[in-house]
């Protein structure tokens, strides 16, 4: 199921996905001066079994000199900052994909991409949070946040992150000293919540990444 | 209580355009995507679009990607749906609905009607 | 895309009866979400997330399935029932509808 909202901004701080759930879309964007093959994908997909999940479809651009008949769909200058402002410089990406059943990892990039990547996460995604350069964290719980769904309505959760204008950066899981368990998540406030969080398989992973060259949008 | 409001009825020539808006009360308007759902006569429902207002960014059904344009007004609390170059088979009742999972408030409808 | 197809188009039935649409998925979602619509109104929530009654709705509705087949069962249909559901996926873009069951009075 889809997330129909966007995880919480944070001052000073930005989030990311270290995998991303099956379900996963993410657009098929080319930079300026290139649009989606005729009849290409429109999104990769990330589909799996119960022992390997992978990105479907291909996303393939080509140069708007040729006939042109898919509006342009890459960002204006002036939009694109705007947005940036949610946005990972480097996502990571899992050094072993199938240590995370159910994931996919940062898919490799393609000709000619735009760049930074929309993603559509489904419920169930957790994204972490760290302050950017030149601020350090407050942490008073863990700096994530996950897609729930309540009522058929879907909400992220509150990231415990306060990011405080000191010169002192902080890293993401697996490059910081041990934050809160899993047992330590605030749990649904109702009794209709319909999806379960995988906080556990999340963190179990989390020092298991590097990071890649992608600016990422996150939807 | 939450009510999403949608400016009346529109009578277009072919090649012409049509705004339509709908205006929404009793939330936080800039927390909840707000998505587009056309329904041409006697037909089922087809979703269009939405727009996040916070950020104006947009995502499209293909099939309305050069049709439908949504828009946002945060100062007003009210989403927009231009569609251009209308035909006859853009007749149809036009509704938005408040997003953030399952569509649980819908706008009255507006009904267009493209005829020469 | 995802298809939503669902059967019958049109059904039907008498107050009191117990009526059954069906809708299945071209592919396998989480989640099938109904509405109801009567003429000249716009859609109403029903069921959300398969088999959860959205406020409001009578206990006489329930919700089912899983994958690709999914049910809407109205236990003793009502007067007020008569009307034109949808099912709907949110599972991947585009949205997706059912193309919709007309309940309609025998």
């Known amino acids: 199921e889809l997330c129909d909202d966007d995880p919480p901004e944070i001052p000073h701080a930005t989030f990311k996905a270290m995998a991303y759930k099956e379900g996963t879309m993410l657009n098929c964007e080319c930079k300026r001066g290139f649009r989606r093959i005729k009849s290409g994908s429109l999104y990769m997909l990330c589909t799996g079994n119960s022992s390997h999940s992978s990105w479907d479809n291909q996303c393939q651009c080509t140069s708007s000199a040729t006939r042109n008949t898919t509006k342009q769909v890459t960002p204006q200058p002036e939009e694109q900052k705007e947005r940036k402002t949610t946005e990972m410089q480097s996502p990571m990406q899992p050094v072993d994909q199938a240590s995370l059943p159910g994931h996919c990892r940062e898919p490799p990039p393609w000709e000619n991409e735009a760049t930074e990547r929309i993603y559509h996460f489904v419920v169930g995604q957790m994204v972490y949070y760290q302050c950017v350069q030149g601020y350090r964290a407050l942490h008073r719980g863990p700096a994530e946040s996950v897609c729930k769904m309540t009522h058929g309505k879907t909400r992220w959760t509150q990231p415990q992150l306060i990011c405080t204008g000191e010169m002192e950066t902080s890293q993401f899981p697996g490059e910081e000293k041990p934050q809160a368990s899993p047992e330590g998540r605030p749990e649904s406030e109702t009794s209709c919540l319909v999806t379960t969080t995988d906080f556990q398989i999340q963190t179990e992973m989390a020092a298991t990444m590097e990071t890649s060259i992608f600016t990422t949008e996150y939807q | 209580q939450v009510q999403l409001v949608q400016s009346g009825a529109e009578v277009k020539k072919p090649g012409s355009s049509v705004k339509v808006s709908c205006k929404a009360s009793g939330y936080t308007f800039t927390s909840y995507r707000m998505h587009w759902v056309r329904q041409a006569p006697g037909q089922g429902l087809e979703w269009i679009g939405y727009i996040r207002p916070k950020k104006g960014y947009t995502e499209y059904n293909q099939k309305f990607k050069d049709k439908a344009t949504i828009t946002a007004d945060e100062s007003t609390n009210t989403a927009y749906m231009e569609l251009s170059s209308l035909r006859s088979e853009d007749t149809a009742v036009y509704y938005c609905?408040?997003?953030?999972?399952?569509?649980?408030?819908w706008g009255q409808g507006t009904l267009v009607t493209v005829s020469s | 895309d995802i298809q939503m197809t669902q059967s019958p188009s049109t059904l039907s039935a008498s107050v009191g009866d117990r009526v059954t649409i069906t809708c299945s998925a071209s592919?396998?979602?989480?989640?099938m979400h109904w509405y109801q619509q009567k003429p000249g109104k716009a859609p109403k929530l029903l069921i959300y997330t398969t088999s959860n009654l959205a406020s409001g709705v009578p206990a006489r509705f329930s919700g089912s399935g899983s994958g690709t087949e999914f049910t809407l069962t109205i236990s003793s249909l009502q007067p007020d029932d008569f009307a034109t559901y949808y099912c709907?996926?949110?599972?991947?873009?585009?949205?997706?509808f059912g193309q919709g069951t007309k309940v309609e009075v025998k």
């Open positions: 592919s396998s979602i989480s989640y």
């Open positions: 609905a408040r997003g953030g999972g399952v569509f649980d408030y």
């Open positions: 709907h996926q949110r599972s991947t873009y585009p949205l997706t």
